[in-house]
């Protein structure tokens, strides 16, 4: 007897059966079944994404494709070789033995066959073709990573080589720094005992100028003094030749007239036979209290009393009203003789005002009244000036009719502000005037445009602030 | 520092009009007064416009009332003179100047020349057909 089946096995494989008599001959088959769904991420017959979503995904799943491909080539071969070698000698015995019908049933198992080998085939060229495409991909993808690692290498060197280059460059500085800390420490060291020993120096030469300045008036003092003794016995002497040569002459006593030692202002000194400008001792009219006042013995025909002076900026002329009062400063350098002391001298006697300027461009000039003096304190040592000459303006620089004396802290000006705080200095301010001979002490170059400097506005008009400057009085009768 | 800068002279017809500039630095126009002031050859230097307390107080001498205004913009810190109707006798050198705002005489309201103490370089202007 003779019969054809087709089945399923467990494991879900078509299976054709062919009963021939005791002979039973069994087919398995690949299906297309067995194959994965086109719903897996690697379908068998789909087209491939554009690229993969990570190479070694990739890597594997062309791994796998070829298991596959290598599989289903080795069942081929395996196939045809049975074909080849069982098939033959059954296919005789098939041919001798069976009937007509059963070549009916041996030529559907060969279509079938065919229709799968050839299904198959058609399956494998596409896994081929997606394995190419892959394939292809991948070494594209491979030689653009290939590039991109080639030029982060470049980069990672040149970026090494520059870190090693500044590594290099900043050890140098550290250690360039280090030189310096330790050369600047060393020099610091050095500067400070440097310091140390010019401040005990600068404080020893202090004091001996000191004592120089003391021993210099005092020699000052004796020289006019043995000047004028000098004088005096010279006229002793002459008077005395002069009786002893008189043939009528009677024996009579030189009375010598008292020695004068103290003296009022600079033009008594000058008088008194000492000529030479210098710091001389001035006493108080009517009273034993002394100052120290600078003599100009040279301008004008000399005899002048300097009661102030600017020439450097080493004084500071922003004081108190006490200290305009009773004077500051050196008279061998900048100072302000004191107001008191002006205000009793010129209250006495008629006494005239010269005050000098130097401008910064080598420039002098002068203004002279005929009559100046101070009122007393209660008034403010207010000012008075009269009869103006000289080269340094046609009109006053000092308001007129005269101001109130005004100091940081005691406001006499006219002025809606307080002129000696805005201005700087003590002065006779009016709202706030065209001059301050006591404003602030400006160099050369930042001399101009200046609001609080020494100022003398009809000689070098408003802003400019002057190199130097000497207000000096005279009597009117000298 | 103190700086002022004018600009914007020239030269113009009779009837005409310019506007000057005065840019100053080193000070705030809060705390200061600005004048405006002229210099014709062979002349004294003379007031022209004064300006205080931002705008606030305004001075014209009698030779320019009527023709000139003088305004100032102090986040600028420029104070500005537009002159009108110019006449051949405003010809000189122009020249802005500053003062300390509170330089002022009890019961007064304008200030010496001699007060002010910050001055330009001048401008130009020239009046001429």
């Known amino acids: 007897y003779s019969n054809f089946r087709k089945s399923v096995d467990s494991t879900g494989r078509r299976q054709y059966q062919v009963q021939n008599g005791p002979c039973s001959y069994t087919f398995l088959l690949p299906e297309t079944d067995s194959c994965r769904s086109s719903s897996s991420p690697y379908m068998s017959n789909a087209v491939q994404r554009d690229a993969p979503l990570d190479y070694d995904d990739s890597v594997q799943r062309l791994q796998v494709l070829e298991n596959i491909l290598e599989n289903n080539t080795q069942w081929l071969m395996k196939l045809e070789n049975y074909i080849q070698d069982n098939m033959k000698k059954e296919m005789v015995e098939i041919q001798q033995n069976v009937v007509q019908n059963q070549t009916a049933v041996m030529i559907e198992i060969g279509t079938s066959l065919l229709n799968q080998t050839a299904a198959q085939t058609r399956k494998l060229t596409d896994v081929e073709a997606q394995v190419l495409n892959q394939t292809t991909r991948l070494e594209l993808q491979l030689l653009q990573h290939s590039i991109s690692t080639n030029k982060l290498e470049k980069q990672i060197l040149d970026q090494t080589s520059e870190i090693n280059k500044l590594q290099n460059k900043n050890s140098f500085l550290e250690q360039k720094v280090l030189d310096m800390e330790g050369k600047h420490s060393e020099q610091l060291q050095s500067m400070k005992e440097q310091k140390d020993e010019l401040q005990v120096l600068v404080s020893k030469q202090s004091s001996v100028i000191d004592e120089l300045e003391k021993k210099l008036v005092t020699a000052t003092v004796n020289n006019s003094l043995l000047q004028k003794q000098q004088h005096d016995l010279m006229e002793t002497v002459n008077s005395l030749l002069t009786m002893m040569s008189s043939p009528n002459s009677k024996s009579s006593v030189a009375i010598r007239k008292e020695e004068q030692t103290t003296f009022r202002d600079c033009a008594e000194i000058f008088k008194s036979g000492l000529t030479t400008s210098g710091i001389y001792t001035l006493t108080f009219p009517n009273s034993t209290e002394e100052i120290k006042a600078y003599c100009d013995m040279d301008v004008g025909g000399g005899g002048w009393t300097v009661i102030q002076h600017r020439e450097d900026g080493s004084v500071d002329f922003q004081r108190t009203w006490k200290e305009y009062k009773e004077g500051f400063g050196s008279p061998l350098g900048e100072y302000w003789l004191g107001n008191e002391f002006v205000s009793q001298l010129t209250g006495q006697h008629r006494y005239v005002l010269k005050i000098q300027l130097k401008d910064w461009e080598g420039n002098e000039a002068h203004s002279l009244y005929d009559h100046f003096y101070l009122a007393g304190e209660e008034s403010n040592y207010r000012i008075h000036l009269t009869g103006l000459t000289g080269t340094a303006g046609k009109i006053s620089s000092i308001s007129q009719p005269g101001s109130d004396f005004s100091t940081k802290d005691s406001d006499n000006d006219k002025c809606i502000c307080k002129c000696s705080q805005m201005l700087s200095g003590g002065w006779w301010f009016d709202a706030c005037g065209p001059s301050n001979l006591n404003g602030q002490y400006y160099p050369q170059k930042q001399n101009t445009n200046k609001f609080n400097g020494i100022k003398w506005y009809y000689w070098k008009g408003s802003g400019y602030s002057l190199k130097a400057t000497t207000m000096m009085i005279r009597p009117a009768d000298f | 520092e103190v700086q002022l800068v004018e600009s914007g002279g020239g030269l113009v017809q009779p009837g005409g009009s310019l506007r000057l500039s005065c840019a100053a630095s080193?000070?705030?126009?809060?705390?200061?007064?600005i004048g405006w002031f002229r210099q014709a050859p062979g002349k004294e230097r003379e007031g022209v416009s004064s300006?205080?307390?931002?705008?606030?107080?305004?001075y014209y001498a009698d030779s320019v009332k009527g023709r000139f205004t003088i305004s100032s913009d102090n986040s600028k810190n420029t104070v500005y003179l537009q002159m009108n109707s110019l006449r051949p006798e405003d010809t000189a050198v122009y020249y802005c100047?500053?003062?300390?705002?509170?330089?002022?005489?009890?019961?007064?309201?304008?200030?010496?020349?001699?007060?002010?103490?910050?001055w330009g370089q001048g401008t130009l202007v020239t009046v001429s057909s």
């Open positions: 080193g000070i705030t126009l809060d705390d200061y007064a």
């Open positions: 100047a500053a003062v300390p705002a509170g330089r002022l005489r009890y019961g007064e309201q304008w200030y010496p020349i001699y007060e002010y103490d910050a």
């Open positions: 300006i205080r307390d931002n705008g606030g107080s305004t």
